[in-house]
Interface confidence: low
């Protein structure tokens, strides 16, 4: 389910109809409300890392930044979750990870993000214009998805470069612009809530947005500003994507699976030395999908010896458009 | 009742390829990956790969890289296996299983098909 | 790849007898084994997965133990239906099934 992200521009209303929308006083306000509390929705980032040591060596990492508990992450290549990707490894916060050739060491970095050393030789080997993949699923927030690759010129030991692309995907140039919105609309909130109720309408009103977009995402400037923007979806040299892409609907996973059905609602658990979430200063950040869980609260899995709770009869939530391979 | 139904035995030629199908009944379908195994005469099971019914996505053991190829069908809630360039080595019981996302094993099994290769 | 090592191979026991069927993975598995019964002509049925724990409707004669590296099985006062080869899986790391035995009543 991919939702592009709408632009909300804000126009000046046709002269005249000021005293005749004197309602915008209090519309305005909650729509910008609105707009201020969606700006916490959660984004993923992507670095792809050619190794200078070892040409045919990538490094993956991903992160997930956002509130909510990660209960899967699926690293797929070639294309995201049923176009194309076929998934390279799956981490589990509780039951651990998966991998398949190329991938070499998989890992979690720090509590919400993962990296992912990559070799290969032949048919399966990766290359430099290979896309990328990292979903998560999270709870409550749904799955999250974002792509990146290495930029054709990209050096050995380089990953991409700090500069943002010249061209942007219609969907990054929206998620920018939305980010502008919701940073001039949460100002002009606290401006509205400091001004007397009997004050002049303002005035500046939202159009309407797309029914497209339930709702905007933001996309954080300072990530925008050091993120290397690339077209997701690039076509794949085919001599650098694995034998088995040429199933009918190939990908990863989880599935696997580019995603996998999971019911996990929990913190992860892991090495008690995870740090913060750390920024990334270059990548290759792509566009984010969203699947929202069917429902809320499921089982975690084992948590420990001698304790298994069993699904729920209608089995785990996919992640929708999701493993993976979960 | 959870059920996977699987196809009739199929007897092939080395060098053709056949495509054998589970048909699953009892929960949802989309909620639950569904692995392939194969049981070679006289020897244990090899896990071969998973589909993610709900958009298609795949893994292969590496071994059957080439080899399987898995699909679905949504709408008839039924997954595929299309095993090519058969040779004798292929002659086995091939068993769909669901698997459980979580815990990782499989829970619920298919009847299994018998792939005969043979001249 | 961890590799299984189930033994034996096959065993004969009498009704209501126990028996014991032991897996030996090539590095620790962390408890992540299930145990299935297979019968001719059907698929195989999960009896107990994360080394103990029964499924639902699986009778409690049958039990199982182990950690690390090493785990066992165990059915106890036999009964015929329990004439079937038994497999252990792994899926700490991928999957991987033991050899099997195969369980005939004297």
């Known amino acids: 389910m991919r939702t592009e992200a709408q632009v909300p521009a804000l126009q000046p209303p046709e002269p005249g109809l000021e005293g005749a929308m004197g309602h915008r006083t209090l519309v305005l306000p909650w729509v910008l409300l609105t707009l201020c509390v969606t700006a916490g929705t959660p984004e993923v980032w992507v670095q792809v890392r050619m190794e200078a040591t070892e040409l045919s060596s990538f490094t993956i990492r991903c992160g997930f930044l956002g509130s909510g508990s990660i209960s899967l992450v699926t690293v797929s290549w070639g294309g995201p979750n049923g176009a194309g990707g076929t998934t390279l490894a799956v981490l589990h916060p509780e039951r651990g990870i998966r991998q398949w050739a190329p991938a070499r060491q998989a890992r979690w970095e720090t509590q919400s993000s993962i990296s992912l050393i990559l070799e290969g030789s032949g048919a399966s080997s990766p290359c430099a214009n290979t896309t990328f993949c990292c979903k998560f699923a999270s709870f409550p927030e749904g799955s999250w998805e974002a792509c990146g690759s290495l930029p054709p010129s990209s050096d050995p030991g380089l990953s991409a470069p700090p500069t943002p692309a010249p061209i942007l995907r219609a969907d990054l140039a929206g998620i920018l612009g939305v980010s502008g919105v919701l940073l001039f609309g949460c100002v002009y909130l606290l401006h509205l809530l400091r001004r007397h109720k009997h004050r002049p309408a303002p005035r500046l009103q939202p159009s309407r947005t797309s029914p497209q977009a339930p709702r905007a995402r933001a996309w954080a400037p300072s990530q925008a500003s050091q993120a290397a923007l690339h077209v997701p979806y690039a076509t794949i040299n085919t001599s650098c994507r694995p034998a088995t892409l040429d199933t009918a609907h190939p990908h990863g996973g989880p599935s696997w699976w580019a995603s996998l059905p999971t019911h996990a609602a929990h913190r992860p658990q892991g090495p008690a030395a995870w740090a913060s979430t750390p920024i990334p200063a270059r990548g290759s950040f792509v566009s984010v999908e969203n699947g929202l869980y069917a429902q809320a609260g499921e089982r975690p899995p084992h948590t420990g010896p001698g304790l298994t709770l069993f699904p729920d009869p209608r089995g785990p939530r996919a992640m929708e458009g999701p493993l993976g391979v979960r | 009742e959870v059920q996977l139904q699987q196809s009739g035995p199929e007897l092939v030629k080395p060098g053709s390829s056949v495509k054998i199908s589970c048909e699953a009944s009892g929960y949802t379908f989309a909620d639950y990956n569904v692995d392939w195994v194969k049981q070679s005469h006289g020897k244990s099971l090899e896990w071969i790969g998973a589909?993610?019914?709900?958009?298609?996505?795949?893994s292969y053991n590496q071994k059957f890289e080439g080899k399987a190829t898995l699909t679905v069908d949504k709408s008839s809630t039924t997954a595929y296996m299309e095993l090519r360039s058969l040779t004798s080595e292929d002659s086995a019981v091939y068993y769909c299983?669901?698997?459980?996302?979580?815990?990782?094993?499989?829970?619920?099994w298919g009847t299994g098909t018998t792939v005969t290769v043979s001249s | 790849d961890i590799q299984m090592t189930q033994s034996p191979s096959s065993l004969s026991a009498s009704l209501g007898g126990k028996v014991t069927i032991t897996c030996k993975a090539s590095?620790?598995?962390?408890?992540?084994i299930a145990w299935y019964q297979h019968k001719p002509g059907k698929g195989p049925r999960l009896l107990i997965h994360?080394?103990?724990t029964l499924q639902p409707g699986i009778p409690s004669r049958f039990s199982g133990s182990g950690s690390g590296r090493d785990y066992s099985f165990s059915i106890s006062n036999l009964e015929p239906e329990d004439i079937a080869t038994y497999y252990c899986l792994q899926y700490d790391n991928l999957w991987t099934f033991g050899g099997g035995t195969k369980l005939e009543i004297k």
């Open positions: 589909i993610n019914p709900n958009d298609g996505g795949t």
């Open positions: 994360y080394t103990s």
């Open positions: 299983a669901r698997w459980v996302i979580n815990d990782w094993y499989f829970d619920v």
């Open positions: 590095q620790d598995i962390n408890k992540y």
